[in-house]
Interface confidence: medium
């Protein structure tokens, strides 16, 4: 591989790597504008820091330290910065691959678990705000009522509920969009850890080519 | 053509369960609501709630909470409502009916006649 | 819970003549999308319940011309022009407006 094929080598990584950094600013800046103008409340008691907010944030931080890694890396040929940037990456892959056997495998569990943590969050309505706000956003935004329908309000149920006559539960219609989109979800989440693959690879073929061009020139 | 299929009768002691059926045939099953309907020996009909089987979403009659729990078998194409902690006041015939979407209960099973009984 | 009352609670009726049954909501069944959600039903002896008629008005397929729905809001009755042995039975008109679902009482219709 010649001085080119390193040069364009490593110009995709910066250019690609700039994309998503911009993209981690992007979902970041969400992520805190929704923990400032906070609508959306708790919706499990028992994991009060699992807010929309708090996700995107997470999700926008990760993906730009990253992203600067590997532009950073790339443009100024560091090799340990390559590395710490092929090492995260490794990591979220690995992480995300367990996750999805998890989620596969106790996909029966997981679903009790909600059930159970939405139905606590249903009691907790009338007398907590944020419990309240996170229904409220849930049911209008969705167009649903309750976990799995009008019964699960014991007192009736609220205002946000929408007056369709034949209303569907909000975590019944969920499972049902995933279940109906899984194909698609199976797509994006395996084009994602394409893009990660072809990110280490990337990383690593650039590692290796700055060695040999050390090598070359004498270094 | 849409037929609703429901067993003839059970006779249970007080204070047991029962699971009726409701098996559904000549349509797509997961498309339609599926009603449950009440009727006491020479009274009137009671609504107890219906059930949509694709998602699972159930919307009940408040009156039947705690008492009845509705449920759907896609693959068998079956709807099943649950009757717990029986009385004599349970004595009744029960109905599955199909939901139009657009309106109301436009085809009608036979009925199941519960007996809670000692 | 909306109360649907109806009246009369029985009614004996000769062969050809007309029958009128009333249905009175104790609050409006205009629904949000400009539909009223009455429906009137048929049980004959020993039978499963029949919808005769729906949206208020709406015949379903099958069900004799002679049978007619009307009203709007909360007042609606079903008219059987020219009554037949046939029609023996009680018939119960439902609510869909509002959970939970609710009957009226229901009319028993016997032929003199």
């Known amino acids: 591989m010649g001085m080119s094929s390193l040069k364009l080598l490593k110009y995709v990584l910066f250019f690609f790597n700039l994309l998503f950094w911009i993209c981690g600013c992007c979902i970041l800046g969400f992520g805190i504008y929704l923990l400032i103008h906070n609508n959306f409340g708790v919706l499990f008691h028992n994991l009060p820091s699992l807010t929309l907010g708090n996700v995107f944030v997470i999700v926008g931080s990760i993906i730009m330290v990253v992203a600067f890694l590997g532009c950073m890396g790339s443009i100024k040929e560091n090799k340990c910065l390559l590395m710490s940037f092929f090492i995260l990456l490794l990591i979220i892959l690995l992480a995300e691959v367990t996750l999805a056997i998890l989620l596969f495998v106790y996909e029966q569990k997981l679903n009790e678990y909600v059930a159970k943590g939405l139905t606590d969050s249903i009691h907790r309505y009338h007398s907590d705000n944020s419990t309240k706000a996170a229904w409220d956003s849930i049911q209008s935004f969705l167009q649903c009522c309750g976990i799995n329908g009008t019964s699960d309000w014991t007192s009736g149920p609220p205002a946000s509920c929408p007056s369709d006559r034949k209303v569907e539960g909000c975590y019944a219609k969920a499972r049902l969009w995933f279940h109906s989109n899984f194909l698609y979800i199976g797509i994006i989440t395996i084009c994602v850890c394409v893009i990660e693959v072809l990110g280490m690879s990337f990383a690593l073929t650039l590692n290796c080519q700055i060695d040999k061009t050390s090598q070359t020139i004498g270094l | 053509q849409v037929q609703l299929q429901q067993p003839g009768a059970e006779l249970v002691k007080p204070g047991a369960s029962v699971k009726l059926s409701c098996k559904a045939s000549g349509y797509t099953f997961t498309s339609y609501w599926m009603h449950w309907v009440k009727q006491r020996p020479g009274q009137g009909l009671e609504w107890i709630g219906m059930?949509?089987?694709?998602?699972?979403?159930?919307n009940h009659n408040g009156k039947f909470r705690g008492k009845a729990t509705l449920t759907v078998d896609k693959s068998s194409s079956t709807a099943y409502i649950q009757l717990s902690s029986l009385t004599s006041e349970d004595s009744a015939v029960y109905y599955c009916a199909r939901d139009d979407y657009a309106e109301t209960m436009d085809y009608w099973g036979q009925g199941t006649s519960v007996t809670v009984s000692s | 819970d909306v109360v649907m009352t109806q009246t009369p609670l029985s009614l004996s009726i000769t062969i050809g003549q007309p029958a009128s049954i009333s249905c009175k909501s104790s609050q409006s069944l205009l629904y949000s999308d400009g539909k009223t959600y009455l429906n009137w039903f048929q049980q004959r002896p020993g039978q499963s319940p029949k919808r005769l008629m729906y949206q208020v008005s709406k015949l379903d397929p099958g069900i004799p011309d002679r049978f007619s729905g009307s009203g709007s809001e909360t007042d609606f009755t079903l008219k059987i022009s020219r009554v037949e042995a046939e029609d023996l039975g009680v018939y119960y008109c439902l609510q869909g407006t509002y959970y939970p679902w609710t009957f009226g009482g229901g009319t028993k219709l016997e032929i003199k």
């Open positions: 059930i949509h089987p694709n998602s699972g979403s159930s």
